[in-house]
């Protein structure tokens, strides 16, 4: 796959994932009433990060915002924070990646700068996706814990006319937003990884290594740390091999103006 395609696809995948993270964060159905023990309910409850809703069989839906900060569970606050951090990082990642796209020309920005920006946006997307996945997973864990706790206390007997009066406790299970969040976080993460891979392709083959050139009797030997690799040239017409160190060029490359690099 070409760098442009990998970068472009990574951007699109991240963008879709990012949109999903926003959608999941805004959705009201993070937890929905478990109907297993009361399938005939005429009132259906569901909750989001920002408000809880009740849908009646009449079709009317009433939602109430959580107008308190101090009274909310710490876990819910943490999930909110993670999702918001994910969105903020995603926004920054998108802005950076737009400028980093190889298919978009902005002034005299060279490929080295684009490579760095691609890597930056890739990392931002990866962190954004991880934030979303962690946030959704924390909420899901909270639901599972509460579900089993309420199952243990499902029915409380109260003395009433004719014996026991049943009080059914409302239990909550996974809502659609959790699945949207997991998928969206995964897509953002994958898109970020693709951007990072594209970044490697934007940089020439040996850009990741500091190199020292030794010129002796018409031959050029490049020594690289992390494994010996040499390039030799014989004869007066042999050009010195081009070696990059963060974009700096060797002294003999004035005739070489490559339009393409070897892809990693």
């Amino acid at each position: 796959m070409s760098v442009t395609a990998c970068q472009g696809l990574g951007f699109v995948v991240s963008l879709i994932g990012f949109a999903g993270i926003i959608a999941a964060t805004c959705m009201d159905q993070w937890s929905t009433q478990d109907l297993y023990n009361n399938p005939v309910t005429a009132v259906f409850n569901y909750q989001g990060l920002w408000r809880s809703c009740v849908r009646e069989s009449s079709g009317f839906t009433e939602c109430r915002g959580y107008f308190t900060l101090l009274g909310l569970p710490a876990m819910l606050q943490a999930v909110r924070a993670l999702m918001i951090v994910g969105i903020v990082l995603g926004v920054i990642g998108i802005l950076v990646s737009i400028f980093a796209l190889k298919c978009i020309r902005i002034g005299s920005m060279d490929d080295s700068a684009k490579a760095k920006m691609t890597l930056t946006s890739g990392i931002l997307f990866i962190i954004s996706g991880i934030c979303a996945i962690i946030g959704v997973s924390v909420f899901a864990n909270m639901l599972v814990t509460n579900f089993w706790m309420s199952t243990a206390n499902m029915y409380s007997g109260m003395g009433g006319m004719g014996g026991m009066v049943q009080t059914v406790q409302t239990r909550y299970t996974f809502g659609a937003a959790l699945f949207v969040g997991w998928v969206a976080g995964g897509l953002t993460l994958i898109g970020g990884v693709m951007m990072c891979i594209a970044c490697r392709g934007l940089t020439p083959d040996d850009s990741n290594f500091k190199a020292v050139s030794y010129h002796a009797s018409g031959q050029n030997v490049a020594y690289r740390p992390g494994g010996f690799k040499a390039s030799t040239g014989f004869g007066s017409n042999t050009r010195n091999k081009k070696i990059y160190d963060g974009g700096a060029r060797t002294e003999d490359d004035e005739q070489s103006h490559p339009t393409k690099y070897d892809y990693v």
Epitope: Q33, N38, V40, T41, A42, V43, N45, Y46, Q47, S52, C53, V54, E56, S57, S58, G59, F60, E62, R64, V165, Q166, T167, V168, Q169, T170
Partner: antibody, heavy 118, light 113 residues
Framework: EVQLQESGPELVKPGASVKMSCKAS????????IHWVKQKPGQGLEWIGY????????KYNEKFKGRATLTSDKSSSTAYMEFSSLTSEDSAVYYC???????????WGQGTSVTVSS | DIVMTQSPSSLTVTAGEKVTMNCKSS????????????LTWYQQKPGQPPKLLIY???TRESGVPDRFTGSGSGTDFTLTISSVQAEDLAVYYC?????????FGSGTKLEIK
């Protein structure tokens, strides 16, 4: 003004079927669910089921499932209830009612009197 | 099914008196999601269809005189008429709106002396 106009009284033979109607006016028919309630002479109220005119989806009280069929027609803003295999126990007044906020039936039809007699 | 039990079955009062009637459900009608009780009160006058008085256990329907008050939570509910009028002669029904099938109480018949 919201109105639910029910069809006239019916005199039917045991084992036969009857189809009664409930014509809604004064509001958007598809926005509200229509419920059906049975009341035997001098007795209490019994819920039969409902029809959602928007989806045409019915829900029945298990007691009446299989004998009551609830339908609706959006074009004429009318809900229908067909009752089959009638017995003397089915002699009653049948009301249609509109469900509103709080799952409360805020508007009721005048009722359709069904008498099952041989 | 939720069983609704109303008491007393009949009441005879004089005009201007305060009346209280009770309704008990076999299961809590309180919805934790909005902290509302899904119980409705209806008034049925002779030869007429029922009329909605109170929903959500205590919310008065528009047009209903303020002498009608609903109260209670969970499984125990009360309808109070602060000062009975002659036109209040009717049967009063409570109804479970919380789960299907919707069930009605057997009714409380209010008679005026």
């Amino acid at each position: 003004e919201v109105q639910l106009q029910e069809s006239g009284p019916e005199l039917v033979k045991p084992g036969a079927s009857v189809k009664m109607s409930c014509k809604a006016s004064g509001y958007t028919f598809t926005n509200y669910i229509i419920h059906w309630v049975k009341q035997k002479p001098g007795q209490g109220l019994e819920w039969i089921g409902y029809i959602n005119p928007y989806t045409d989806g019915p829900k029945y009280n298990e007691k009446f499932k299989g004998r009551a069929t609830l339908t609706s027609d959006k074009s004429s803003s009318t809900a229908y209830m067909e009752f089959s295999s009638l017995t003397s126990e089915d002699s009653a007044v049948y009301y249609c009612a509109r469900l509103n906020r709080g799952n409360a039936m805020d508007y009721w039809g005048q009722g359709t009197s069904v008498t099952v007699s041989s | 099914d939720i069983v609704m039990t109303q008491s007393p079955s009949s009441l005879t009062v004089t005009a201007g008196e305060k009346v209280t009637m009770n309704c008990k459900s076999s299961q809590s009608l309180l919805n934790s999601g909005n902290q509302k009780n899904y119980l409705t009160w209806y008034q049925q006058k002779p030869g007429q269809p029922p009329k909605l008085l109170i929903y959500w256990a205590s919310t008065r329907e528009s047009g209903v005189p303020d002498r009608f008050t609903g109260s209670g939570s969970g499984t125990d509910f009360t309808l109070t008429i602060s000062s009975v009028q002659a036109e209040d002669l009717a049967v009063y029904y409570c109804q479970n709106d919380y789960s299907f099938p919707f069930t009605f109480g057997s009714g409380t018949k209010l008679e005026i002396k």
